[in-house]
Amino acid sequence: QRFAQAQQQLPLESLGWDVAELQLNHTGPQQDPRLYWQGGPALGRSFLHGPELDKGQLRIHRDGIYMVHIQVTLAICSSTTASRHHPTTLAVGICSPASRSISLLRLSFHQGCTIASQRLTPLARGDTLCTNLTGTLLPSRNTDETFFGVQWVRP
Amino acid sequence: QRFAQAQQQLPLESLGWDVAELQLNHTGPQQDPRLYWQGGPALGRSFLHGPELDKGQLRIHRDGIYMVHIQVTLAICSSTTASRHHPTTLAVGICSPASRSISLLRLSFHQGCTIASQRLTPLARGDTLCTNLTGTLLPSRNTDETFFGVQWVRP
Amino acid sequence: QRFAQAQQQLPLESLGWDVAELQLNHTGPQQDPRLYWQGGPALGRSFLHGPELDKGQLRIHRDGIYMVHIQVTLAICSSTTASRHHPTTLAVGICSPASRSISLLRLSFHQGCTIASQRLTPLARGDTLCTNLTGTLLPSRNTDETFFGVQWVRP
């Protein structure tokens, strides 16, 4: 069935197609479990349309419900190293403003070297998302193995 | 950049809700690591609205940012067989045109029998996506265990 | 902010932005493998915009293609317990009406404590989705570890 008559139309901008897909830049110093991200066409296939990066962390620019997704692969990893260095955990959460701090998504690497998941969550303009990786293993910086993104879904 | 001037509006249909969900048809011959996909209502719950299949590989018909997702389950598999036949790896990438060839998403089966992930990536009209499964284990053809899909998200 | 003036554009409702993200309420009694879900802003970050809950199961209100996603983490679980209590399997399917009963997505916990996946599937008004967890281990009720959601994608 046709979606709409030609005369009924939406300005595309007002649909709020905020979207970002980021690649890993680096990990933090010793006591900082956060992953630091980067994005932009010059870097490959990563991009930011709406959200922004603030010191490697993703800041939301538009209120709404978002699909948040992530994949992280550990760099020097096999089933044996994964279990030997086990456990390693990844958590994605709102880290700022402090009043809205909450863990949104949490996964452990159990005998595996990759975690991947996604979820729908309400986010507000100004929310900064942090991805915390605890454990001794380093994440891969390969762009097809480690990535993090958000997609605006509805108001 | 601004998406559109207020007066320039899009008929909703032209927003390009291209979407496809495919089920596994078969694996390739000995030296071909590609998985061959099929889709269509006659086959069950798989479908193609926009993208097309070209010899079992998915071809994109509309430029844009897409959410690509995949799940592959190994057929005759337990934790022990998975580790014994390790490494088994799945990679999703653009395989044609050759000038745009790139790996988009890569996962290994470590002691596990299923991988599942998703990511946002820009795709262009004519891009063909290939899914390469390396290793000796065969993927399950059950439609609730192995599937591959794309969803157009924004221009 | 209002999406659009009524005369020039489509009412938001007609776009069909049906979406839901649920958190685990409880498991069923001994012989019932279903997970029972709950949602609503009073509970935290879960919500239902369009779909409804019917005795803890998600009922669809609008025909269309949906992105279905789920993550389940086992509560009493570490690398060692996961393999000891194997096999534990999660299946998401249409459980009612009976004439449309089908398994949409299936995953096993192999040496791991979390499964996460997503897929595109056509759903019809009145379809009820059930999530069956087989095995002796209980799922975590933490909202960042176990969640289930759907997002309407297109007609």
Partner: antibody, heavy 123, light 108 residues
């Protein structure tokens, strides 16, 4: 071998403060949610507070909210309980306990316990 | 908060006896119910989780049943080392676990 060793207990006057510590060894401390559970003399078990593996989430029983603060130093494998405005009813043996799951989340299945440290609040 | 009520608060039994302790939750908690054993002067020990699953290393004479609001711990044949206090605990709440008041099992 997993070991949890509490310290810092003792006699304190009502209104006073005390800081308990729990030194952990034998497991990857940062991956486990940790709790404090107390037991008044001759009484039952009462959960007091918990903190997630990464230290992001903290939880408190209503009876101690606003007076006690739980924290952890994962680099030192140590859990803390800062107890302020102590009352006679806070007198108890305080145990630290680890969650069974290594996801870092609090699931409330306590599989490892310390031997406890006695806190006495009396004038 | 979810209240947990155990009965009886104490019981006397002999070696070889079958012992049953019950625990009732003030609201539905599914199977999110655990049992602990505590011997005098010692820390508690996890016996059963998820209402029915035996914790690692726990003898098979211990068993758990129930779901919803009513739960039971059964010791099929009481052994000398089983004389202790038993606690139920709900793990349904994502913010605060609560224990029952305990059941003391004494030698008759």
């Amino acid at each position: 071998e997993v070991q949890l060793l509490e310290s810092g207990g003792g006699l304190v006057q009502p209104g006073g403060s005390l800081r308990l510590s729990c030194a952990a060894s034998g497991f990857t401390f940062s991956q486990y949610s940790m709790s404090w559970v107390r037991q008044a003399p001759g009484k039952g078990l009462e959960w007091v507070s918990a903190i997630s593996g990464g230290g992001v989430s903290t939880y408190y029983a209503d009876s101690v909210k606003g007076r006690f603060t739980i924290s952890r130093d994962n680099s030192k494998n140590t859990l803390y309980l800062q107890m302020n405005s102590l009352r006679a009813e806070d007198t108890a043996v305080y145990y630290c306990a680890s969650d069974i799951s290594d996801s870092g989340g609090s699931h409330w299945y306590f599989d490892y316990w310390g031997q406890g440290t006695l806190v006495t609040v009396s004038s | 908060d979810i209240q947990m009520t155990q009965s009886p608060s104490s019981l006397s039994a002999s070696v070889g006896d079958r012992v049953t302790i019950t625990c009732r939750a003030s609201q539905y908690i599914g199977r999110y119910l655990n049992w602990y054993q505590q011997k005098r002067g010692k820390a508690p020990k996890l016996l059963i989780h998820g209402a029915t699953s035996l914790a690692s290393g726990v003898p098979s004479r211990f068993s758990g049943s129930g779901s919803g609001t009513d739960f039971t711990l059964t010791i099929s044949s009481l052994q000398p080392e089983d004389f202790a206090t038993y606690y139920c605990q709900q793990s349904y709440s994502t913010t605060s676990p609560t224990f029952g008041q305990g059941t003391k099992v004494e030698i008759k």
